[in-house]
Interface confidence: medium
Amino acid sequence: TEVKVTQPEKSVSVAAGDSTILNCTVTSLLPVGPIRWYRGVGQSRLLIYSFTGEHFPRIRNVSDTTKRNNMDFSIRISNVTPEDAGTYYCVKFQRGSSEPDTEIQSGGGTEVYVLAK
């Protein structure tokens, strides 16, 4: 069966300067390939976090994704700023051998509202 990506929160509200967790789980780790978080859609979408080892300031994974069969790909964004507002998508990719990774499933999106402190 096809992998399913679930983002249970439709939206989260966070005060500027605070941190927030964006939840995402998958039903399977197959097919082999990374999970990435984006803000926005289409041409304007911005890579926020990738579970592939790179360093992303202010963002880290919530659970230990090196553990076998971990299905939780939630992230924590620290020191939130008004520029962080937008809709975040958790996206599962299938790894390509020579060609680029292929996007196969996206979560429904979580809207982040940033409140003035």
Epitope: K4, T6, P8, E9, S11, V12
Partner: antibody
Framework: EVQLVESGGGVVQPGRSLRLSCAAS????????VNWVRQAPGKGLEWVSL????????YYADSVKGRFTISRDNSKNTLYLQMNSLRAEDTAVYYC????????????WGQGTLVTVSS | ETVLTQSPGTLTLSPGERATLTCRAS??????LAWYQEKPGQAPRLLIY???SRATGIPDRFSGSGSGTEFTLTISSLQSEDFAVYYC??????????FGGGTKVEIK
């Protein structure tokens, strides 16, 4: 105070159509996702359809897909359910239900309107 | 789709007794579970969300617990107005949103 008032129910023959309305007040209608949930006589609750605040995102239960159409008019604070090709098994009380703004559970419900499909 | 199974189908108790209703999910829904009360001729009413948080205005004799696939709604001391049908609903999975089949709490 949140109010949801359904209307448009009645007795209709199989194969015919009916349009339900739900008038909303007491909250910013366009900011909330709203749903139709039904309950057949003597049965449990069954989710029917969902529409997002903007109207851009729509989902249907498999049992009504292709026959029912959900829509909303945010300028009139009204939710609609156009029901075509009605069947006896569509007989139920139809409720409109307002979702929580963060999660897909239902904070507020209307009193319901009864749809009876019978020849 | 996540299937919710409620048990028992009917619970026959006296006022003042404790009622324990169970809802089991076919797959984990974490704590994304709500409970509703429905009385004849009335709209359903939200009691519990997030598996254990009481909705506004709900008396503290109602409590929810559980996570993953097993959930419980407890009414610590039944009042006459509590005799009704209770439904659980999961909101973790994407639509279709699913309800359990209901538990009727009736007077002995």
């Amino acid at each position: 105070e949140v109010q949801l008032v359904e209307s448009g129910g009645g007795v209709v023959q199989p194969g015919r159509s009916l349009r339900l309305s739900c008038a909303a007040s007491g909250f910013t209608f366009s900011s909330y996702d709203v749903n139709w949930v039904r309950q057949a006589p003597g049965k449990g609750l069954e989710w029917v359809s969902l529409i997002s605040g903007s109207g851009e995102i729509i989902y249907y239960a498999d049992s009504v897909k292709g026959r029912f159409t959900i829509s909303r008019d945010n300028s009139k604070n009204t939710l609609y359910l156009q029901m075509n090709s009605l069947r006896a098994e569509d007989t139920a009380v139809y409720y409109c239900a307002k979702e929580n703004n963060r999660y897909r559970f239902f904070d507020d419900w209307g009193q319901g309107t009864l749809v009876t499909v019978s020849s | 789709e996540t299937v919710l199974t409620q048990s028992p189908g009917t619970l026959t108790l006296s006022p003042g007794e404790r009622a324990t209703l169970t809802c089991r999910a076919s797959q984990s829904v974490y704590t994304y579970l709500a409970w509703y009360q429905e009385k004849p001729g009335q709209a359903p009413r939200l009691l519990i969300y997030g598996a254990s948080s009481r909705a506004t205005g709900i008396p503290d004799r109602f409590s929810g617990s559980g996570s993953g696939t097993e959930f419980t709604l407890t009414i610590s001391s039944l009042q006459s107005e509590d005799f009704a049908v209770y439904y659980c609903q999961q909101y973790y999975d994407r639509p279709p949103l699913t309800f359990g089949g209901g538990t009727k709490v009736e007077i002995k």
